[in-house]
């Protein structure tokens, strides 16, 4: 599951993993565009075992997993601008 | 050429414990997540765990959560399986297998096991 | 959790036949589907990977295809080598295995 926010108003993540994580493991993420308070583009990883882990957004294989979601997204009908959960 | 020996099984009772080993080869053990995956007496294949490459990350299906925990030895090239408050349902054969590759970003599957050890519960 | 069914259970083939297992999804799997074979006394052997992708020494004679909720898994040209019993993984989220199907000489 995708989730969009645009509701932060500042940095969530202290330092950011680029450690490959499997879509299997991962029960949602969330991304925080740039702005807002924070000058970057946060993502923010929620695994299967509960734990949260923020990604670099250049990492290759979120990029991946990303894309195939924006795909997905854009075959379902539209949902609310403040929070996109793409299944 | 890429080796796994399971070793560990055996009988044990109701509510007992075991410990499993898996001893890797033939290739960088450090470098791939580790799985357990169980044959039951029925013949259905059941995932039990996995392990991220350095250890920080396990994940478990429901029914041996709280139960079962997964750990890895890398500087011995080893995989472990502590099962306790076990239960006539877990009797099976147990095999580990190689899991995706840590530092890759491919979404791939296990694809080496072992020839399995046997647990059997039972009172 | 995602469940498999796997069908058919079990099947008999001639030498040289050719033979297809299918499995479905209870929720889209996003292509995230394995095939492996197994005999006894040993693991299980990887024979295919994101639906369709070939693991390295497995012939051509393996396919595998489907999308969605629906995959199927096509041997041609049958061995003797190839009686042994086939399962499904999905992958996409968490694991789960078909309940296997397990392939006889005719």
């Known amino acids: 599951v995708l989730e969009v926010y645009y509701t932060h108003l500042r940095c969530r993540c202290v330092q950011e993993s680029s450690v490959f994580i499997p879509r299997r493991f991962i029960d949602r993420i969330q991304i925080s565009p740039r702005g807002n308070g924070c000058p970057r583009k946060e993502i923010i990883v929620w695994k299967k075992n509960k734990s949260v882990v923020c990604v670099d957004p250049q990492a290759e294989w979120i990029q991946r997993i990303m894309e195939m979601l924006r795909k997905k997204s854009s075959s379902t009908p539209p949902v609310p601008v403040f929070k996109r959960k793409i299944p | 050429e890429v080796q796994l020996v399971e070793s560990g099984g055996g009988l044990v009772k109701p509510g007992g414990s075991l410990k499993l080993s898996c001893a890797a080869s033939?290739?960088?053990?450090?470098?791939?997540?580790m799985s357990w995956v169980r044959q039951t007496p029925e013949k259905r294949l059941e995932w039990v765990a996995t392990i991220s490459d350095g250890g920080s990350d396990a994940y478990y299906p429901d029914n041996v959560k709280g139960r079962f925990t997964i750990s890895r030895d890398n500087a011995k090239n080893n995989l472990y399986l502590q099962m306790s408050h076990l239960k006539s349902e877990d009797t099976a054969m147990y095999y580990c297998?190689?899991?995706?590759?840590?530092?890759?970003?491919?979404?791939?599957?296990?694809?080496?096991w072992g020839q399995g050890t046997s647990v059997t519960v039972s009172s | 959790d995602i469940q498999m069914t796997q069908s058919p259970s079990s099947l008999s083939a001639s030498l040289g036949g050719k033979v297809t297992i299918t499995c479905k999804a209870s929720?889209?799997?996003?292509?995230?589907i394995a095939w492996y074979q197994h005999k006894p006394g040993k693991g299980p052997r990887l024979l295919i990977h994101?639906?369709?992708t070939l693991q390295p020494g497995i012939p051509s004679r393996f396919s595998g295809s489907g999308s969605g909720r629906d995959y199927s898994f096509s041997i041609s040209n049958l061995e003797p080598e190839d009686f042994a019993t086939y399962y499904c993984l999905q992958y996409d989220n968490l694991y789960t295995f078909g309940g296997g199907t397990k392939l006889e000489i005719k």
């Open positions: 929720q889209d799997i996003n292509k995230y």
């Open positions: 033939g290739f960088t053990f450090s470098s791939y997540a």
């Open positions: 994101y639906t369709s």
């Open positions: 297998a190689r899991d995706y590759y840590g530092s890759g970003y491919e979404d791939s599957p296990m694809d080496y």
